[in-house]
Amino acid sequence: RQQWELQGDRRCQSQLERANLRPCEQHLMQKIQRDEDSYGRDPYSPSQDPYSPSPYDRRGAGSSQHQERCCNELNEFENNQRCMCEALQQIMENQSDRLQGRQQEQQFKRELRNLPQQCGLRAPQRCDLEVESGGRDRY
């Protein structure tokens, strides 16, 4: 069994190295920004939303294209739930330092958890997407 797990880990590692998760990251970032444009973002903000809607985000065409490419990539992990979880964790890790607000981080996590389902794939049952708040200091 240990041998099988070792092979499984190696296979997952090479799958992750081959995968291009950027379309997923682009899709998710566009999605959470579009949602904030639509619904308002800072309950403490005076009268107007801090950010005005962007015509590019509003169109959503770019985002659906990213989603399609993202789903194609995630499809590779369908038969390995643990590896699917690692892919999601990698996406979270790659974007965590872009999210400098609690709401943004939570919304990104929510959308990320829903991603496999949106792609018509099984979502991993237990998958810890926690990162240090406000992204990691990489500099």
Epitope: R22, E25, Q26, L28, M29, Q30, Q33, R41, D42, P43, Y44, S45, P46, P50, Y51, S54, Y56, H66, N94, Q95, R98, L99, Q100, G101, R102, Q103, Q104, E132, S133, G134, G135, R136, D137, R138, Y139
Partner: antibody
Amino acid sequence: QVQLVESGGGVVQPGRSLRLSCAASGIAFNDYTMHWVRRAPGKGLEWVAAISYGGTNKYYADSVKGRFTISRDSSKNTLYLQMNSLRAEDTAVYYCARDSGYRSLLHWGQGTLVTVSS
Amino acid sequence: EIVLTQSPLSLPVTPGEPASISCRSSQSLVHRNGYNYLDWYLQKPGQSPQLLIYMASKRASGVPDRFSGSGSGTEFTLKISRVEAEDVGIYYCMQALQTWTFGQGTKVEVN
């Protein structure tokens, strides 16, 4: 009404210390990264330091690394900048700013003047 | 460290006329998520800075539509379609790809 109010500025001798405070009201202070930015007389804006909403991550400009420490007190909705080993070139108006959540500086205080002079 | 170079450093303008400021980065500001982490700020005389444009081309709320941002990678531009007297001040670009750094500023004053 969004308000960020800096205090603690003043005249200090080189090598001495000073602690700036920034009191926040009307914004979700505890949910966002906070920044300190300064502007020296006759110069441009210089980003100084930032602290993530949970206080876990701290970021510093090279010019202040090892001398300045950023911190926050969630219970008081207050941001701090502890400035040690002050130099003449640290003379500036210091602003605190709240991040938008996407790394832009959305809300700014009015600033407090720090003068380092013997 | 990423260095931002603005030009011109001083820009005399005529109300009603267009104006444009350039910001060049020492390295690409495109993140892997597709966004350019480049903002524009304006500091009017005697005031605190204010956010005008974020992520290269998105206008912050309350900012008049005469302000627009464009560019990608290392070359960015802030355009004012028709300058008004209230637009005077110092304009800064700022990168947020790696920590945060500002350009040296462009002083815009009425002719």
